[in-house]
């Protein structure tokens, strides 16, 4: 008699390895015979696709090597005609040993950047991620982090980051290793000790350190005048990434000397510089004409404290005058920031005026000096207790960096305001805010003895200061 | 670009005064940090230096012809000019104006293509 | 007066240098110009302030200047460098002064 078909065992979900066989049963009663068609994710498998095997009339469906692709819901539909179509629905479950698609790298990162070494994997279960670093499991902390794709991010990375890394991906069926890669920490070139400031007398000998660290080591250089080192002798040792410079000289003339230290990452180069003057004891230099020219000022450091349109005095007795004068006052304006705020922007603007004097406009280019009321002002209103403070130093030999005697003028030689007011060059910063007539200092007990023009400003907001000069 | 061109008489007789105008265009003669010299140079021989006007217009002489030489302005057409009183044929030279410039060290960085002066009876 | 002192002429090989020298005393002391004159030319400024380039003048055009002596290098001399070489000084009276000339012949 005819019967409509049963499904006699429904389907199960089945779980299959990657590349191995999988076959679901699905055996029907029924007569006549049945037509049995399946679907994987309601989309017909085809009889000839040959990625399957159908038999015993259709009841068995083998997945010849099972794909991750193949992962989905199988029915079997059987019909006779008598009756309706039965349908028995499973699931394929691929699983999957843990799979590294995506290893890690080798990686070159400059310290305080962030590091990212990727580890993506597949498997099923999903794998968890960890990382070994040389022998050790790595613990997570506030700049380590294992991310949801498998990948190791290292924030503000530091050289003891630097080692051998390895990504492991591990499931119930299995355990991934990726190859070790290496993350390498490169360090911008530091300077740990720079070269001390000497007052020598004429023919001595001086040994200048400059002590420089960075990964790679850098290389140090030594400038004298803005020119490359022409005499004395250079002795060089590298310790545990420390560079130690030594430049002995015998001194015949007065002179800033420039350590340099470079170190190169990829195609970029990273510098850190010191200077140190070396002056000779009661020298006077044996020319009395000015040596140099005129030009817009171009550096960073006076920006904001030198007058827009006018010219400026480079030296020539430098070889590189705008570098060798920038240079001068960037090595005395950080002095500076320890100094207090009455003072700070006065000796900023005494500063920068007299390293970059105005150009005459005449008609051969000569520096304006500085006139002496407005030094005076700075030396014995603004910055009275920091100036004693650097001449007792001065004085018992203990002023570190003797930039200042470059860079800081002897207010007695300059020529008076009053003698002729086109041969000095006034300090803005320093003059009376007529608009802002709030801006008188307190004025302290002991009167200064110095005829200030007008009276100064201690109003931050009536100074120009400019950002710190970067050397890097 | 500044642009400096001499003019003036090609023939002086001796005793009279040369007189040499050079006309500036480009830039003004008053213009800070720049001056303004003659400069000459006698028929296969060398250069010679013979004053300056300044931009405020002061003026400066080379000290063997400062007796003979004055050098002044015309603002209004920015003009400079030469006298050279009491002159005698070893003043005949090519003469020269050009810009000295404070920003080349004083240099004559502008030069005229200058203009023949002979001093014959 | 100050006094200036070259030498008439200096004679160099195609591509090889060339060392033209200006006596002064002291002339360290000052800027030194260079000037490069033509025949029936103008001069023209190829160095200021000892050893400054101007724009447009090649690179193997340096100088130096120290003690009595300021000296022009053209390294690798061309053919187009034949002419004639005049070093400049302001003293501090403001008095220029040249020197007498150096004519360069390229072999």
């Known amino acids: 008699l005819p019967k409509a078909p049963v499904i006699t065992t429904p389907l199960e979900t089945v779980d299959a390895l990657v590349e191995e066989v999988a076959t679901f049963m699905c055996a029907v009663e029924s007569y006549p015979q049945p037509e049995i068609s399946w679907t994987r994710n309601k989309i017909l498998i085809k009889l000839f696709d040959t990625r399957y095997s159908i038999r015993e009339n259709g009841q068995l469906l083998t997945i010849l090597s099972v794909e991750d692709s193949d992962d989905g819901i199988y029915c079997c539909t059987a019909n006779n005609g008598v009756g309706g179509a039965v349908e028995s629905c499973g699931a394929l479950q691929v699983k999957m040993k843990p799979k590294i698609t995506r290893p890690p790298i080798n990686v070159k990162i400059i310290e305080g950047l962030k590091a990212v070494l990727p580890c993506t994997t597949m498997g099923n279960p999903k794998p968890s991620v960890s990382w070994i670093k040389g022998d050790s499991p790595l613990r997570e902390n506030s700049r380590t982090a294992v991310l949801e794709s498998g990948s190791l991010r290292i924030h503000n990375v530091q050289k003891e980051d630097a080692g051998q890394y390895r990504c492991v991906a591990k499931n119930s069926l299995g355990t991934a290793y990726s190859k070790v890669v290496k993350l390498e920490v490169e360090v911008f070139a530091r300077i740990l000790r720079a070269p001390e400031s000497h007052n020598v007398t004429f023919g001595s000998f001086v040994t200048l350190h400059c002590t420089a660290t960075g990964i790679p080591v850098p290389t140090i250089t030594w400038i004298e005048n803005g020119n490359a080192v022409s005499s004395g002798s250079i002795q060089e040792s590298v310790k545990d990434r420390v560079i130690d410079s030594r430049l002995q000289l015998f001194i015949t003339k007065p002179g800033l000397y420039t350590c340099i230290a470079t170190n190169k990452h990829g195609e970029k180069f990273s510098t850190a510089k010191a200077a140190a003057t070396v002056s000779i004891a009661e020298w006077s230099k044996p020319q009395k004409d000015n040596k140099g020219y005129c030009a817009q000022y171009r550096g960073e450091v006076c920006n904001a404290v030198l007058a827009k349109d006018a010219l400026v005095f480079l030296n020539t007795s430098y070889a590189d005058p705008e570098e060798a004068q920038e240079l001068l006052v960037h090595t005395a304006w950080n002095e500076l920031k320890v100094v207090s705020p009455l003072c700070r922007p006065a000796a900023e603007a005494l500063l920068c005026n007299h390293v970059f004097q105005e150009c005459s406009p005449g008609v051969v280019p000569t520096p304006i000096p500085i006139c002496r009321e407005y030094c005076l002002a700075v030396k014995e209103l603004f910055c009275a207790k920091e100036w004693l403070a650097m001449e007792e130093k001065t004085h018992r030999g203990l002023y570190r960096s003797e930039m200042h005697l470059l860079s800081v003028p002897e207010c007695s030689k300059l020529p008076s305001m009053h003698w002729d007011p086109t041969a000095c060059a006034r300090l803005p910063h320093l003059d009376y805010n007529k608009e802002n007539p709030k801006t008188f200092p307190p004025m302290t007990s002991s009167k200064p003895s110095v005829d200030i023009p007008n009276l100064p400003s201690s109003s931050s907001s009536s100074f120009s200061v400019s950002p710190t000069y970067s050397m890097t | 670009q500044v642009q400096v061109q001499e003019s003036g008489p090609g023939l002086v007789k001796p005793s009279q005064t040369l007189s040499l105008t050079c006309t500036v265009s480009g830039g003004s003669i008053t213009a800070r940090y720049y001056s303004w010299s003659w400069i000459r140079q006698p028929p296969g021989k060398g250069l010679e230096w013979m004053g300056v006007i300044a931009y405020d217009g002061s003026t400066y002489y080379s000290p063997s012809l400062k007796s003979r030489t004055s050098i002044s302005r015309d603002t209004s057409k920015n003009q400079f000019s030469l006298h050279l009183s009491s002159v005698t044929p070893d003043d005949t030279a090519v003469y020269y104006c050009a810009r000295g410039s404070s920003r080349v060290a004083a240099a004559f960085d502008s030069w005229g293509q200058g203009t023949q002066v002979t001093v014959s009876s | 007066s100050y006094e200036l002192t070259q030498s008439p002429s200096v004679s160099v090989a195609l591509r090889q240098t060339a060392k033209i020298t200006c006596g002064g005393d002291?002339?360290?002391?000052?800027?030194a110009q260079w000037y490069q004159q033509k025949p029936g030319q103008a001069p023209v400024m190829v160095l200021y302030?000892?050893?400054r380039r101007p724009s447009g003048i090649p690179e193997r055009f340096s100088g130096s200047n120290s003690g009595n002596t300021a000296t022009l290098t053209i390294s690798g001399a061309q053919a187009e460098d034949e002419a004639d070489y005049y070093c400049?000084?302001?003293?501090?009276?403001?008095?220029?002064?040249f020197g007498g000339g150096t004519h360069l012949t390229v072999l």
């Open positions: 302030a000892d050893s």
């Open positions: 002291n002339i360290g002391s000052k800027n």
């Open positions: 400049h000084v302001w003293d501090s009276s403001t008095n220029a002064w």
